[in-house]
Interface confidence: medium
């Protein structure tokens, strides 16, 4: 599923991401835009043999199990394929664990490079939330 911007903002708010660990909803929508272009089925392979999955591009080295990443920790205790569902529950729950891990949203390279320090509220402007 490819979400619309406001559609995703509403879904993320329903799942409790607004101001989760101090990060406003705009941060999460911005991260999803630059990680996956709002596509829940996005997958991207990394040079270390791991793969990033889903709307927030969660990595199989640490957070989920795709059955083929050497030394996978699977800290979210889920199959990576669950992160590709049109229902973003699994991605949100895992993202909450990631953002609580100490580095906050810096764990997402796209957020760090494209969203951090910008007017992230623009990503939810005009949305009925």
């Amino acid at each position: 599923k490819v979400f619309g911007r406001c559609e995703l903002a509403a879904a993320m708010k329903r799942h409790g991401l607004d101001n989760y660990r101090g990060y406003s909803l705009g941060n999460w929508v911005c991260a999803a835009k630059f990680e996956s272009n709002f596509n829940t089925q996005a997958t991207n392979r990394n040079t270390d043999g791991s793969t990033d999955y889903g709307i927030l591009q969660i990595n199989s080295r640490w957070w989920c199990n795709d059955g083929r990443t050497p030394g996978s920790r699977n800290l979210c205790n889920i199959p990576c394929s669950a992160l590709l569902s049109s229902d973003i529950t699994a991605s949100v729950n895992c993202a909450k664990k990631i953002v609580s891990d100490g580095n906050g949203m810096n764990a997402w390279v796209a957020w760090r490079n494209r969203c951090k320090g910008t007017d992230v509220q623009a990503w939810i402007r005009g949305c009925r939330l």
């Epitope: 089925q41 040079t47 795709d66 083929r68 050497p70 590709l84």
Partner: antibody, heavy 116, light 107 residues
Amino acid sequence: QVQLQESGAEVMKPGASVKISCKATGYTFSTYWIEWVKQRPGHGLEWIGEILPGSGSTYYNEKFKGKATFTADTSSNTAYMQLSSLTSEDSAVYYCARGDGWYGYWGQGTTLTVSS
Amino acid sequence: DIELTQSPATLSVTPGDSVSLSCRASQSISNNLHWYQQKSHESPRLLIKYVSQSSSGIPSRFSGSGSGTDFTLSINSVETEDFGMYFCQQSNSWPRTFGGGTKLEIK
């Protein structure tokens, strides 16, 4: 136990297309990548690409882009590979395998012969 | 693409001999190297994963070693059922690649 059952041998004419199937049993089909591998005598084993059945995500070896197309049906736990515009170079044994980084589970292979 | 070069191409041995098969990668692949055996008209069978981890049901006479770019599959006291082709495969990067194979034949 994990098993991959491939469709039977095919004899096709040059220019035609063929669709090979790979039915998986014994594990959660949607959560593991299915890999496709080509074997020709004297050419060893070649990785064609992979599909994650739960999402339909696919990756192809550049060499096989435009030649192979992967699909999967999670209701029947079956992965498919279609090969198009067949030539004699496509005559080979094609294997599906479960993608665990290594390939611990293989189909029995489908022999494709392209001949006029 | 990572190229895997296997040597020798053919190895002629007598049952009871011990042998070593080599697989060399064109660049470092850490420990992401796996070995397969294939007999005529059969699918490949996983022997060793991640350089040295034996696959389930594989006899203890098969062992693997190496790291980086140079890897070895050793067979301690070859048995008649061991004759066939042996392939290495890397999962360090895409596309996945295989070595050209070593044929183990009876002398």
